[in-house]
């Protein structure tokens, strides 16, 4: 018996097209949409257990959906790798494994899914409601990272209910061609929309195959995960003992806000600009909170679970301190 | 074997820069962050800054601010450190150093001396 | 910045003895329940190694003679039983504070 946190993957709904063939014109525009929505966007899920037999042992699994080969990937806790988390293990498909305390057992299960083995006691050992964290390097769509943890107030034996998470990160997104075929298809989505502004709409027929709702469902309140594809990181903040953010970031803010890099090989990219969605300024960060975003200046509550978004981490030691690489 | 390869010795004249070179070996490269740590002889260790590989981020000591300039080439797995304007406090012995967050820097170059001497 | 300052600055000792090294921190080097103290040994003509990670993970391929303790601002190397091949100088380092990882002064081990 195992309690279990999973962390699907999102995939955004499919409505079926009345009339689809009768509506030609109207084709161009759900497919351009569907790509807007869904191209350059692979996905990582997250599965976090903790054993009914050792209370304290975790077994974090971790997938990608892209179609690109994995180059690396990092596990971390505490926090997503540079931005609050430390270091459990690294994989890598050719040159090997490396893992750190108290990770014990860390393997490939697949092409595209590892598996990593915590053990259950000792001064450095995970609580229940750590924050776990897999990040997949690919060519071609770059760095993506998720995080997940247990409910604080699971019991073992039991399954926790699947709950949403963003698509984390991009660091590397994709390849700029692709980017600019997309971009286009996207503006001309827009120019079509307008021209149709006056039209009767088609009517949408709920999906007829059971999968599909939920689907819909995962996809429609997540705001958060199209936000976080826009701002350069997002994590579920619950960690066991979630440091303030003065002292996450004890220089009063990001330091590595102002050096973002500026090319769009390194710049988040996500399905749909959200031209509202403000970017967070230098030592400024953007809540989501039950599906609302609060900007800088309020500090979000770090007694429960939540989503933060923080700026693309510097690197080891936005891991390393409060973080953990350096 | 995970291995950092430095460049060799530089005796330079004071005023002048110096760029070292370390050549990251290991597919950590991508993953961690490149440090940089000064010695002087019969010193101890001083953290100069480092260089973040996947996020192109570099963080400095306040006290090295002006004086190191921190770089990488991905595609050759090189970070790189300048100091400029040399005077004869900055010869050193100068490490280069990766690590994974959190678990201090697991892998040291073998060091390069550099001599500021007129 | 946080300083870190070890005890004593030299140490003599005779084979098989336990060694004790003292690090205290001027602040707590604390986060996310964990101890962002490491601890290195180097050697004349040598970079320094990697011995304990996180207050008290001990890194690959290092003797479990070899141990480290501690949380928040106080941290102990120990070396039991001391052997010819330790006569070195052991630095702590604290990575929990950005973008400064300050090292301690060091502790020179010493055989008599």
């Known amino acids: 018996m195992r309690t279990e946190a999973q962390v699907p993957a999102l995939q955004p709904p499919e409505p079926g097209l009345e009339g689809a063939m009768g509506h030609r014109t109207l084709v161009l525009p759900w497919v351009l949409l569907t790509l807007c929505v869904t191209a350059g966007t692979p996905e990582v899920w997250v599965q976090v257990r903790m054993e009914a037999t050792e209370l304290s042992s975790f077994t974090i699994r971790c997938g990608f959906l892209g179609s690109g080969s994995i180059s690396l990937v990092t596990v971390s806790w505490g926090g997503p790798n540079g931005a609050g988390g430390t270091t459990l293990a690294v994989l890598h498909p050719e040159r090997g494994i490396r893992q750190w305390a108290p990770a014990r057992q860390a393997r490939w299960e697949t092409q595209s899914s590892i598996s990593l083995i915590l053990e259950g006691s000792g001064a450095s050992s995970p609580c229940a409601n750590t924050t776990f964290c897999c990040k997949f390097a690919s060519f071609p769509e770059g760095s993506w990272e998720a995080c997940g943890s247990l409910p604080p107030s699971s019991d073992p034996g039991l399954s926790a209910p699947p709950t949403p998470a963003p698509i984390l990160r991009a660091d590397l997104a994709g390849i700029l061609g692709v980017s600019g075929v997309l971009l286009f298809g996207c503006v001309y989505l827009l120019h079509l929309l307008r021209r149709h502004k006056h039209r009767p709409a088609p009517r949408l027929q709920p999906s007829r195959t059971s999968p599909q709702a939920p689907r819909a469902r995962a996809w429609a309140p997540s705001q958060a995960s199209q936000a976080a594809l826009h701002v350069p990181y997002a994590t579920i903040n619950t960690s066991c003992r979630p440091a303030t953010l003065d002292t996450a970031h004890p220089h009063g803010g990001p330091s590595w806000w102002a050096s973002l890099p500026t090319h769009a090989a390194h710049r988040p990219q996500g399905p749909a600009a959200w031209a509202s969605t403000p970017i967070p300024a230098r030592g400024s960060f953007v809540s989501v909170e039950n599906g609302l975003y609060a900007q800088a200046g309020e500090r979000p509550p770090h007694t429960g679970p939540g989503l933060t978004l923080f700026p693309d981490p510097r690197g080891p030691r936005a891991m390393e301190g409060p973080l953990g690489v350096r | 074997q995970h291995e950092l390869q430095q460049s060799g010795a530089e005796l330079v004249r004071p005023g002048s820069s110096v760029k070292l070179s370390c050549k990251d070996s290991y597919f950590a490269f991508m993953a961690s962050a490149m440090h940089w740590v000064k010695q002087r002889p019969g010193h101890g260790l001083e953290w100069i800054g480092s260089?973040?590989?996947?996020?192109?981020?570099?963080e400095y000591s306040e006290n090295f601010k002006g004086k190191a300039t921190l770089t990488a080439n991905t595609s050759s797995n090189t970070a790189y450190m300048e100091l400029s304007s040399l005077i004869s406090e900055d010869s050193a012995v100068y490490y280069c150093?990766?690590?994974?967050?959190?678990?201090?820097?697991?892998?040291w170059g073998q060091g390069t001396l550099v001599t500021v001497s007129a | 910045d946080i300083v870190l300052t070890q005890s004593p600055a030299s140490l003599a000792m005779s084979l098989g003895q336990r060694a004790t090294i003292s690090c205290r921190a001027s602040?707590?080097?604390?986060?996310?329940?964990?101890?962002?103290m490491h601890w290195y040994q180097q050697k004349p003509g040598q970079p320094p190694k990697l011995l304990i990670y996180r207050a008290s993970n001990l890194e690959s391929g290092i003797p479990a003679r070899f141990s480290g303790s501690g949380s928040r601002t106080d941290f102990t190397l120990t070396i039991n039983p001391v052997e010819t091949d330790d006569v070195a100088t052991y630095y702590c380092q604290q990575s929990n504070k950005d973008p400064m990882y300050t090292f301690g002064g060091g502790t020179k081990l010493e055989i008599r």
């Open positions: 260089f973040t590989m996947y996020s192109d981020a570099t």
């Open positions: 150093a990766s690590g994974y967050s959190g678990n201090g820097f697991t892998y």
């Open positions: 602040e707590s080097v604390d986060n996310y329940g964990i101890s962002f």
